[in-house]
Interface confidence: medium
Protein backbone atom coordinates (compact mmCIF):
# COMPACT_ATOMS: atom_id res chain seq x y z
CA UNK A 1 0.00 0.00 0.00
CA UNK A 2 1.16 3.47 -0.99
CA UNK A 3 2.06 5.53 2.07
CA UNK A 4 -0.59 8.09 2.01
CA UNK A 5 -1.02 11.91 3.44
CA UNK A 6 -2.95 12.47 6.41
CA UNK A 7 -5.84 14.05 4.49
CA UNK A 8 -5.47 10.84 1.81
CA UNK A 9 -6.11 7.47 1.85
CA UNK A 10 -5.14 4.83 -0.51
CA UNK A 11 -6.52 3.96 -3.31
CA UNK A 12 -4.91 0.74 -5.48
CA UNK A 13 -0.92 1.89 -5.67
CA UNK A 14 -2.49 5.58 -5.63
CA UNK A 15 -3.39 8.01 -3.11
CA UNK A 16 -7.09 10.29 -2.91
CA UNK A 17 -7.86 13.06 -1.40
CA UNK A 18 -10.45 12.10 1.66
CA UNK A 19 -14.01 13.06 1.99
CA UNK A 20 -14.75 15.37 4.64
CA UNK A 21 -17.08 14.58 7.31
CA UNK A 22 -20.97 14.14 7.16
CA UNK A 23 -19.22 13.00 3.33
CA UNK A 24 -19.14 9.58 1.79
CA UNK A 25 -16.80 8.77 -1.35
CA UNK A 26 -19.19 8.37 -4.21
CA UNK A 27 -16.02 7.45 -6.54
CA UNK A 28 -12.44 7.23 -6.11
CA UNK A 29 -10.22 10.18 -8.14
CA UNK A 30 -8.68 9.46 -11.17
CA UNK A 31 -5.41 10.62 -13.18
CA UNK A 32 -7.59 14.06 -14.20
CA UNK A 33 -10.68 13.34 -11.64
CA UNK A 34 -10.38 14.41 -7.54
CA UNK A 35 -12.44 12.20 -5.14
CA UNK A 36 -16.45 12.33 -5.68
CA UNK A 37 -17.98 13.15 -2.64
CA UNK A 38 -21.64 12.77 -1.72
CA UNK A 39 -23.46 13.35 1.24
CA UNK A 40 -24.48 11.05 3.86
CA UNK A 41 -28.65 10.45 4.04
CA UNK A 42 -30.48 11.35 7.17
CA UNK A 43 -30.18 8.46 9.62
CA UNK A 44 -26.68 8.14 8.82
CA UNK A 45 -23.26 9.79 9.76
CA UNK A 46 -19.26 9.88 9.52
CA UNK A 47 -17.47 11.98 12.19
CA UNK A 48 -14.12 12.21 10.11
CA UNK A 49 -12.40 12.50 6.99
CA UNK A 50 -12.50 9.28 5.21
CA UNK A 51 -12.44 7.09 2.49
CA UNK A 52 -15.53 5.02 3.26
CA UNK A 53 -17.44 4.25 0.40
CA UNK A 54 -21.15 4.16 3.15
CA UNK A 55 -22.11 6.09 5.79
CA UNK A 56 -22.07 4.49 9.10
CA UNK A 57 -25.62 3.79 10.61
CA UNK A 58 -26.33 6.08 13.40
CA UNK A 59 -27.19 4.10 16.62
CA UNK A 60 -30.54 3.86 18.24
CA UNK A 61 -31.37 4.85 21.45
CA UNK A 62 -33.79 1.86 22.87
CA UNK A 63 -35.98 3.04 25.63
CA UNK A 64 -36.70 -0.88 26.33
CA UNK A 65 -32.84 -0.86 28.00
CA UNK A 66 -34.00 2.56 29.77
CA UNK A 67 -32.06 4.79 27.13
CA UNK A 68 -33.05 8.09 25.54
CA UNK A 69 -31.10 10.17 22.46
CA UNK A 70 -29.52 12.58 24.99
CA UNK A 71 -27.63 14.15 21.50
CA UNK A 72 -29.66 13.59 18.08
CA UNK A 73 -27.63 12.07 15.20
CA UNK A 74 -26.14 14.23 12.69
CA UNK A 75 -24.84 13.84 9.30
CA UNK A 76 -21.28 14.46 11.30
CA UNK A 77 -21.78 12.88 14.47
CA UNK A 78 -23.51 10.05 16.09
CA UNK A 79 -26.66 10.11 18.12
CA UNK A 80 -25.58 9.74 22.26
CA UNK A 81 -27.81 7.81 24.38
CA UNK A 82 -28.20 8.34 28.12
CA UNK A 83 -30.06 7.05 30.73
CA UNK A 84 -33.70 7.62 30.68
CA UNK A 85 -35.21 9.41 34.02
CA UNK A 86 -35.68 6.96 36.70
CA UNK A 87 -32.60 4.94 35.66
CA UNK A 88 -28.97 4.24 35.63
CA UNK A 89 -26.17 3.46 33.80
CA UNK A 90 -24.93 -0.45 34.35
CA UNK A 91 -22.67 -0.74 31.24
CA UNK A 92 -20.79 1.82 28.85
CA UNK A 93 -20.02 1.73 25.94
CA UNK A 94 -16.74 4.12 24.68
CA UNK A 95 -18.08 7.35 25.97
CA UNK A 96 -21.65 6.69 26.07
CA UNK A 97 -23.99 4.43 28.68
CA UNK A 98 -25.46 1.23 25.92
CA UNK A 99 -27.90 -0.30 28.98
CA UNK A 100 -29.47 1.12 31.98
CA UNK A 101 -31.71 0.39 35.03
CA UNK A 102 -34.77 1.43 36.50
CA UNK A 103 -34.26 2.54 40.07
CA UNK A 104 -35.48 0.63 42.57
CA UNK A 105 -39.10 1.00 43.84
CA UNK A 106 -40.70 0.21 46.92
CA UNK A 107 -41.60 -2.97 47.75
CA UNK A 108 -45.21 -3.99 49.01
CA UNK A 109 -44.95 -3.34 52.56
CA UNK A 110 -42.71 -0.13 51.72
CA UNK A 111 -43.75 3.48 51.04
CA UNK A 112 -41.59 5.40 48.90
CA UNK A 113 -39.64 7.95 51.16
CA UNK A 114 -38.22 10.31 48.64
CA UNK A 115 -38.70 9.30 45.05
CA UNK A 116 -36.32 8.19 42.39
CA UNK A 117 -35.06 11.44 40.01
CA UNK A 118 -32.57 11.22 37.01
CA UNK A 119 -29.80 11.54 39.70
CA UNK A 120 -30.96 10.21 43.14
CA UNK A 121 -32.14 6.25 43.64
CA UNK A 122 -35.73 5.71 45.33
CA UNK A 123 -35.64 5.86 48.73
CA UNK A 124 -37.68 3.11 50.79
CA UNK A 125 -38.73 2.78 54.76
CA UNK A 126 -40.78 0.10 55.56
CA UNK A 127 -44.51 0.63 56.70
CA UNK A 128 -45.18 0.97 60.17
CA UNK A 129 -46.71 -2.04 62.10
CA UNK A 130 -50.38 -2.04 61.28
CA UNK A 131 -50.07 -0.03 58.00
CA UNK A 132 -49.74 -1.29 54.88
CA UNK A 133 -48.49 -0.08 50.86
CA UNK A 134 -50.29 -2.19 48.65
CA UNK A 135 -47.66 -1.62 45.56
CA UNK A 136 -44.63 0.03 47.52
CA UNK A 137 -45.40 3.63 45.40
CA UNK A 138 -47.30 4.80 47.86
CA UNK A 139 -45.53 8.29 50.11
CA UNK A 140 -48.06 7.42 53.22
CA UNK A 141 -48.57 4.34 53.99
CA UNK A 142 -52.32 2.92 55.09
CA UNK A 143 -54.06 2.25 58.45
CA UNK A 144 -55.79 -1.82 57.98
CA UNK A 145 -58.80 -0.67 59.57
CA UNK A 146 -59.26 2.11 56.85
CA UNK A 147 -60.29 -0.09 54.21
CA UNK A 148 -62.20 -3.46 54.80
CA UNK A 149 -60.99 -5.42 51.53
CA UNK A 150 -57.36 -5.42 52.70
CA UNK A 151 -56.06 -7.74 55.80
CA UNK A 152 -52.72 -6.78 56.93
CA UNK A 153 -50.94 -9.11 57.77
CA UNK A 154 -47.17 -9.06 59.35
CA UNK A 155 -44.07 -11.00 58.32
CA UNK A 156 -42.26 -8.98 61.40
CA UNK A 157 -41.51 -5.06 62.70
CA UNK A 158 -41.78 -3.07 59.65
CA UNK A 159 -42.61 -5.60 57.31
CA UNK A 160 -46.75 -5.30 56.93
CA UNK A 161 -47.88 -6.49 53.89
CA UNK A 162 -51.54 -7.02 52.51
CA UNK A 163 -53.63 -9.76 50.92
CA UNK A 164 -56.78 -9.96 49.32
CA UNK A 165 -59.81 -11.10 51.47
CA UNK B 1 -9.19 3.62 32.29
CA UNK B 2 -11.52 2.24 35.21
CA UNK B 3 -10.15 -0.12 37.72
CA UNK B 4 -11.78 -1.35 41.05
CA UNK B 5 -9.56 -2.79 43.84
CA UNK B 6 -10.72 -4.98 46.56
CA UNK B 7 -8.88 -5.26 50.00
CA UNK B 8 -9.36 -6.73 53.47
CA UNK B 9 -8.25 -9.66 55.59
CA UNK B 10 -8.46 -12.96 54.26
CA UNK B 11 -9.24 -15.30 57.22
CA UNK B 12 -12.28 -14.13 59.55
CA UNK B 13 -13.95 -16.03 62.56
CA UNK B 14 -17.66 -17.87 62.72
CA UNK B 15 -20.16 -15.29 63.99
CA UNK B 16 -17.26 -11.80 63.84
CA UNK B 17 -18.19 -9.62 60.75
CA UNK B 18 -16.48 -9.67 57.59
CA UNK B 19 -15.36 -6.24 56.29
CA UNK B 20 -14.16 -5.51 53.21
CA UNK B 21 -13.30 -2.20 50.77
CA UNK B 22 -13.12 -1.30 47.09
CA UNK B 23 -10.43 1.55 45.72
CA UNK B 24 -11.71 2.52 42.52
CA UNK B 25 -9.28 4.93 40.49
CA UNK B 26 -10.28 5.97 37.00
CA UNK B 27 -14.51 6.92 37.82
CA UNK B 28 -15.91 8.78 40.07
CA UNK B 29 -18.41 6.52 42.59
CA UNK B 30 -20.89 9.50 42.52
CA UNK B 31 -20.93 10.04 38.96
CA UNK B 32 -23.27 7.23 37.64
CA UNK B 33 -23.63 3.36 37.94
CA UNK B 34 -24.84 0.95 41.00
CA UNK B 35 -21.35 -0.25 42.95
CA UNK B 36 -22.02 -3.74 43.51
CA UNK B 37 -20.51 -6.87 45.65
CA UNK B 38 -20.76 -10.33 44.36
CA UNK B 39 -18.94 -13.25 45.71
CA UNK B 40 -18.31 -16.62 44.54
CA UNK B 41 -18.34 -19.59 46.32
CA UNK B 42 -16.27 -22.50 46.15
CA UNK B 43 -17.56 -24.73 42.89
CA UNK B 44 -18.01 -20.92 40.98
CA UNK B 45 -21.37 -20.84 42.09
CA UNK B 46 -21.56 -16.68 42.03
CA UNK B 47 -23.99 -14.30 44.14
CA UNK B 48 -25.02 -10.72 43.90
CA UNK B 49 -25.30 -9.51 47.44
CA UNK B 50 -26.11 -5.92 47.50
CA UNK B 51 -25.65 -2.70 45.76
CA UNK B 52 -24.57 1.35 46.52
CA UNK B 53 -25.86 3.48 43.84
CA UNK B 54 -23.65 6.89 42.99
CA UNK B 55 -27.10 8.72 44.99
CA UNK B 56 -25.68 6.85 48.12
CA UNK B 57 -28.84 4.48 47.72
CA UNK B 58 -28.42 0.52 48.67
CA UNK B 59 -30.67 -2.17 47.40
CA UNK B 60 -29.70 -5.81 48.97
CA UNK B 61 -30.14 -9.60 48.23
CA UNK B 62 -33.06 -10.70 50.16
CA UNK B 63 -31.11 -13.37 51.25
CA UNK B 64 -28.82 -11.34 53.34
CA UNK B 65 -30.77 -8.37 54.07
CA UNK B 66 -30.47 -9.23 57.98
CA UNK B 67 -26.76 -9.26 58.24
CA UNK B 68 -25.22 -6.84 54.90
CA UNK B 69 -24.42 -3.26 54.87
CA UNK B 70 -23.05 -1.41 52.29
CA UNK B 71 -21.36 2.17 52.47
CA UNK B 72 -18.91 4.38 50.71
CA UNK B 73 -16.16 7.00 51.31
CA UNK B 74 -16.63 9.31 48.46
CA UNK B 75 -14.02 11.68 49.52
CA UNK B 76 -11.84 8.31 49.28
CA UNK B 77 -13.48 7.26 45.97
CA UNK B 78 -13.95 3.85 47.90
CA UNK B 79 -17.20 1.77 48.98
CA UNK B 80 -17.27 -0.89 51.75
CA UNK B 81 -19.43 -4.31 52.53
CA UNK B 82 -19.69 -5.03 55.93
CA UNK B 83 -21.52 -9.00 56.59
CA UNK B 84 -22.11 -9.89 60.18
CA UNK B 85 -22.36 -13.05 61.84
CA UNK B 86 -20.55 -14.64 58.97
CA UNK B 87 -20.29 -18.67 59.00
CA UNK B 88 -18.04 -21.11 57.25
CA UNK B 89 -20.71 -20.97 54.27
CA UNK B 90 -19.44 -16.77 53.53
CA UNK B 91 -16.16 -18.35 52.40
CA UNK B 92 -15.48 -17.15 48.82
CA UNK B 93 -14.05 -15.10 46.47
CA UNK B 94 -15.39 -11.48 46.94
CA UNK B 95 -15.99 -9.20 44.07
CA UNK B 96 -16.60 -5.63 43.80
CA UNK B 97 -17.81 -4.44 40.58
CA UNK B 98 -19.47 -1.07 38.55
CA UNK B 99 -22.58 -1.65 36.83
CA UNK B 100 -21.56 -5.19 34.81
CA UNK B 101 -18.77 -3.72 32.51
CA UNK B 102 -15.64 -3.44 35.16
CA UNK B 103 -14.86 -5.87 37.96
CA UNK B 104 -12.11 -6.14 40.40
CA UNK B 105 -9.91 -8.88 40.43
CA UNK B 106 -11.14 -10.56 44.07
CA UNK B 107 -10.18 -11.36 47.15
CA UNK B 108 -9.84 -14.41 48.84
CA UNK B 109 -11.74 -14.82 52.41
CA UNK B 110 -11.80 -18.19 54.04
CA UNK B 111 -14.46 -18.15 57.41
CA UNK B 112 -13.07 -20.81 59.91
CA UNK B 113 -11.74 -20.57 63.59
CA UNK C 1 -35.82 -14.26 42.97
CA UNK C 2 -35.62 -15.46 39.35
CA UNK C 3 -33.46 -18.91 39.11
CA UNK C 4 -31.04 -19.17 36.04
CA UNK C 5 -30.63 -22.88 34.34
CA UNK C 6 -27.58 -23.06 32.00
CA UNK C 7 -26.90 -26.25 29.96
CA UNK C 8 -25.24 -28.31 29.72
CA UNK C 9 -22.98 -28.04 32.96
CA UNK C 10 -20.11 -29.04 31.02
CA UNK C 11 -19.54 -28.98 26.75
CA UNK C 12 -16.96 -30.15 25.08
CA UNK C 13 -15.81 -28.79 21.87
CA UNK C 14 -13.65 -29.06 18.86
CA UNK C 15 -11.76 -26.03 17.55
CA UNK C 16 -13.68 -24.54 14.82
CA UNK C 17 -16.78 -26.15 15.83
CA UNK C 18 -19.85 -24.00 16.63
CA UNK C 19 -21.40 -24.38 20.46
CA UNK C 20 -24.81 -23.04 21.41
CA UNK C 21 -24.76 -22.54 25.47
CA UNK C 22 -28.47 -22.08 26.64
CA UNK C 23 -29.93 -19.85 29.27
CA UNK C 24 -33.34 -20.76 30.64
CA UNK C 25 -34.84 -18.21 33.41
CA UNK C 26 -38.09 -19.33 35.97
CA UNK C 27 -39.41 -16.26 34.78
CA UNK C 28 -39.33 -14.08 32.24
CA UNK C 29 -36.83 -11.20 31.63
CA UNK C 30 -36.10 -8.00 29.82
CA UNK C 31 -32.58 -9.13 28.68
CA UNK C 32 -30.20 -11.63 29.10
CA UNK C 33 -25.91 -10.61 30.31
CA UNK C 34 -23.38 -13.09 29.42
CA UNK C 35 -19.90 -13.40 31.44
CA UNK C 36 -16.77 -15.50 30.26
CA UNK C 37 -14.71 -16.47 33.11
CA UNK C 38 -11.18 -18.21 32.79
CA UNK C 39 -9.30 -19.75 35.76
CA UNK C 40 -7.91 -17.13 38.29
CA UNK C 41 -9.37 -14.54 36.73
CA UNK C 42 -12.78 -12.46 37.49
CA UNK C 43 -15.48 -13.04 34.84
CA UNK C 44 -15.72 -10.85 31.92
CA UNK C 45 -18.69 -9.24 30.35
CA UNK C 46 -19.16 -10.62 26.79
CA UNK C 47 -22.93 -9.80 25.91
CA UNK C 48 -25.08 -7.42 27.14
CA UNK C 49 -28.54 -7.12 26.39
CA UNK C 50 -29.19 -10.43 24.73
CA UNK C 51 -27.13 -9.56 21.76
CA UNK C 52 -24.67 -6.71 21.80
CA UNK C 53 -21.24 -7.37 21.85
CA UNK C 54 -19.24 -6.34 24.74
CA UNK C 55 -16.17 -3.95 23.70
CA UNK C 56 -13.33 -6.14 21.85
CA UNK C 57 -15.01 -9.21 22.04
CA UNK C 58 -14.65 -10.97 19.00
CA UNK C 59 -17.55 -11.48 16.64
CA UNK C 60 -17.90 -15.09 16.52
CA UNK C 61 -19.61 -14.55 19.73
CA UNK C 62 -23.61 -14.35 19.78
CA UNK C 63 -26.37 -14.35 21.32
CA UNK C 64 -30.39 -14.34 20.91
CA UNK C 65 -33.49 -15.45 22.99
CA UNK C 66 -36.02 -13.70 24.47
CA UNK C 67 -39.01 -14.37 27.60
CA UNK C 68 -37.39 -16.74 29.48
CA UNK C 69 -34.79 -18.83 27.16
CA UNK C 70 -32.07 -17.10 25.97
CA UNK C 71 -28.78 -18.74 24.27
CA UNK C 72 -25.00 -17.93 23.34
CA UNK C 73 -23.53 -18.86 20.36
CA UNK C 74 -19.50 -19.21 19.62
CA UNK C 75 -19.72 -19.79 15.73
CA UNK C 76 -16.12 -20.93 15.51
CA UNK C 77 -14.65 -22.40 18.50
CA UNK C 78 -10.55 -21.38 19.51
CA UNK C 79 -8.05 -22.22 21.93
CA UNK C 80 -9.04 -19.40 23.94
CA UNK C 81 -12.34 -19.98 24.49
CA UNK C 82 -12.36 -22.57 26.97
CA UNK C 83 -13.45 -20.83 30.16
CA UNK C 84 -16.81 -21.16 31.89
CA UNK C 85 -19.84 -19.32 30.85
CA UNK C 86 -22.73 -17.32 33.00
CA UNK C 87 -26.01 -15.86 32.03
CA UNK C 88 -26.95 -12.91 34.21
CA UNK C 89 -30.10 -11.05 34.69
CA UNK C 90 -30.54 -7.99 36.03
CA UNK C 91 -34.66 -7.36 35.65
CA UNK C 92 -34.69 -8.19 39.10
CA UNK C 93 -32.51 -8.40 41.42
CA UNK C 94 -29.61 -9.60 40.10
CA UNK C 95 -29.12 -13.44 39.65
CA UNK C 96 -26.66 -15.57 37.97
CA UNK C 97 -26.81 -19.31 36.37
CA UNK C 98 -24.62 -21.37 37.39
CA UNK C 99 -22.11 -21.34 34.59
CA UNK C 100 -21.37 -24.07 31.39
CA UNK C 101 -18.11 -24.98 31.07
CA UNK C 102 -15.99 -25.23 27.49
CA UNK C 103 -13.48 -27.53 27.30
CA UNK C 104 -11.65 -27.90 23.90
CA UNK C 105 -11.44 -31.45 22.50
Known amino acids: LPSCKEDEYPVGSECCPKCGPGFHVRQACGEQTGTVCEPCSPGTYIAHFNGLSKCLQCQMCDPAMGLRTSRNCSTTANALCGCSPGHFCIIQDGDHCAACRAYATSSPGQRVQKGGTESQDTLCQNCPPGTFSSNGTLEECQHGTKCSKWLVTEAGPGTSSFRWV | DVQLQESGPGLVKPSQSLSLTCTVT?????????WNWIRQFPGNKLEWMGY???????SYNPSLKSRISITRDTSKNQFFLQLNSVTAEDTATYFC??????WGQGTSVTVSS | QIVLTQSPAIISASLGEEVTLTCSAS?????MHWYQQKSGTSPKLLIY???NLASGVPSRFSGSGSGTFYSLTISSVEAEDAADYYC????????FGAGTKLELK
Open chain 2, 97 to 102: TRGMDY
Open chain 2, 26 to 34: GYSITSDFA
Open chain 2, 52 to 58: IVYSGST
Open chain 3, 27 to 31: SSVSY
Open chain 3, 49 to 51: STS
Open chain 3, 88 to 95: HQWSSYLT
